[in-house]
């Protein structure tokens, strides 16, 4: 069975009040993607199902937009949005793949001065 690779936007930072695109890309496999889940820590953000389309979790409906592609756009960011985000690809016949993104939401003045979050 061929094993693919998940590429993500990695560790990213954004300004409070702004928006950010979370992107994952599955490559190096011919597996069929049947569903992609977007999760934040222990919360479901959204599902993109190959047959049923997008479902945005009710608690995020006002601030989450589907796309581009299989990605997710987070809007009206707050410092509470800082944390880990996961894209979970359900595929046939490979099984599941998970990508991890760490988002740091910065106060406007900090973001304007070019600060960037880094994991040592």
């Amino acid at each position: 069975m061929m094993t693919g690779t998940i590429e993500t936007t990695g560790n990213i930072s954004a300004e409070k009040g702004g928006s950010i695109i979370l992107q994952c890309h599955l490559s190096s496999t011919t597996a069929q993607v049947t569903q992609v889940n977007w999760e934040q820590q222990d919360q479901l953000l959204a599902i993109c199902n190959a047959d049923l389309g997008w479902h945005i979790s009710p608690s995020f409906k006002d601030r989450v937009a589907p796309g581009p592609g299989l990605g997710l756009t987070l809007q009206s960011l707050t410092v509470n949005d800082t944390g880990e985000y996961f894209c979970i690809y359900h595929t046939y016949p490979d099984g599941t793949y998970t990508g991890r993104i760490f988002l740091e939401v910065l106060e406007s003045s900090v973001a304007e001065h070019g600060a960037r979050f880094q994991i040592p």
């Epitope: 998940i6 999760e39 990508g99 991890r100």
Partner: nanobody, 121 residues
Framework: QVQLVESGGGLVQAGGSLSLSCAAS????????MGWYRQAPGEQRDLVAT???????TYGDSVKGRFSISRDSAKNTVYLQMNNLKPEDTAVYYC???????????????WGQGTQVTVSS
């Protein structure tokens, strides 16, 4: 080194029930999804059920309403309760998980050795 160890397979009559469990052990920093896939002779490995960290379950069409997946996060263990089993459920059942071994690593994809489930008519 991460290991997935399945238990609970066996022979059961049609209409009966069986429970499978899968325990992940080793170097585990985080688990995003655990689940079950099955493979009948001469066929591709197919989805049975998965359960994500956020609690979202996904089931294969042929098992919906009959099988139920659950977990014990503290024990890094996932369970599959199979009811109203049919002869066409006969297959090798594999545990599958996406596991991060350290804070700096990416999620690896792991499979168990498989456990045979045979449903007789």
């Amino acid at each position: 080194q991460v290991q997935l160890v399945e238990s609970g397979g066996g022979l059961v009559q049609a209409g009966g029930s069986l429970s499978l469990s899968c325990a992940a052990s080793g170097s585990i920093f985080g688990i995003s999804v655990m689940g079950w896939y099955r493979q009948a002779p001469g066929e591709q490995r197919d989805l049975v059920a998965t359960l994500t960290r956020a609690g979202l379950t996904t089931y294969g069409d042929s098992v919906k309403g009959r099988f139920s997946i659950s977990r014990d996060s503290a024990k890094n263990t996932v369970y599959l309760q199979m009811n109203n089993l049919k002869p066409e459920d006969t297959a090798v059942y594999y545990c599958h998980a996406n596991i991060m071994e350290s804070a700096a690593s990416t999620f690896g994809r792991y499979w168990g050795q498989g456990t045979q489930v045979t449903v007789s008519s």
